[in-house]
């Protein structure tokens, strides 16, 4: 559900939304930390209806959701966090 990528690509998000998406309609979340060609952190959400949206990292709901997902992934519950190290 929650993925953290370190990438050398430029910014992926042209426009960001802060509109709430309940977790039940989210397929996965990709986090692109700032640096390596993009000056800001980006969050990309894949929805269950196959659409994709960039979410404002400052949106309160996404911060709450990521915290829940981090807690779940640090326990024995099946919500993996995948990380790619900087080459």
């Amino acid at each position: 559900v929650l993925e953290v990528y370190y990438t050398s690509l430029r910014c992926r998000c042209v426009q960001e939304s802060s509109v709430f998406i309940p977790r039940r309609f989210i397929d996965r979340i990709q986090i692109l930390p700032r640096g390596n060609g993009c000056p800001r952190k980006e969050i990309i959400v894949w929805k269950k209806n196959k659409s994709i949206v960039c979410v404002d990292p400052q949106a309160e709901w996404i911060q709450r959701m990521m915290e829940v997902l981090r807690k779940r992934s640090s326990s024995t519950l099946p919500v993996p966090v995948f990380k790619r190290k900087i080459p």
């Epitope: 709430f20 039940r24 099946p78």
Partner: antibody, heavy 123, light 106 residues
Amino acid sequence: EVQLVESGGGLVQPGGSLRLSCAASGFTFSSYAMSWVRQAPGKGLEWVATISEGGSDAYYPDNVKGRFTISRDNAKNSLYLQMNSLRAEDTAVYYCARDYYGSGYEESPMDYWGQGTLVTVSS
Amino acid sequence: DIQMTQSPSSLSASVGDRVTITCKASQDINKYIAWYQQKPGKAPKLLIHYTSTLQPGIPSRFSGSGSGTDFTFTISSLQPEDFATYYCLQYDNLYTFGGGTKLEIK
């Protein structure tokens, strides 16, 4: 007081189409996602579709995907369900329900429901 | 898809009894479960969401507990108006209702 009133049900032949409506009042319609849930005679509840508060996102279970389309008109405080290629197993009471508050961040489920409209698919 | 197995499917009890209904999810749903009451010919009514949060106006004799995959709904002391069918709903991953529990007068 939150009120949801469904209409448009009736008898339709297999393969036919029907459009259900739901008139909402007593709350800020454009701030809430909305859903349709159905109940076959003597059976349990089954989720059919959900649409986001602005109408840009719709979600369906696999058994109705491609046949049913949920839509809304926020100016008219109305929710719709267009049902095509209807089958006998689509026979049910169809309820519209208020879903999550789109301007918030609470993971709330459907809270208020209408009284339902009966759809019968039979030849 | 997440399956919700609700038990029992029917239950006979008397006024004043303590009644417990269970729902088991096929995978972890955190605490994202709701409970509804439905009377014949009527729309479902939300009683509890997020496992244990009572809706405004719902009597305190209704309660819920659990997390992960196993959840319980309890009526501490049955009242005449509580005889109805009860459904659980998971809303962690799309929506799935349990099969329902019909609560009848013994």
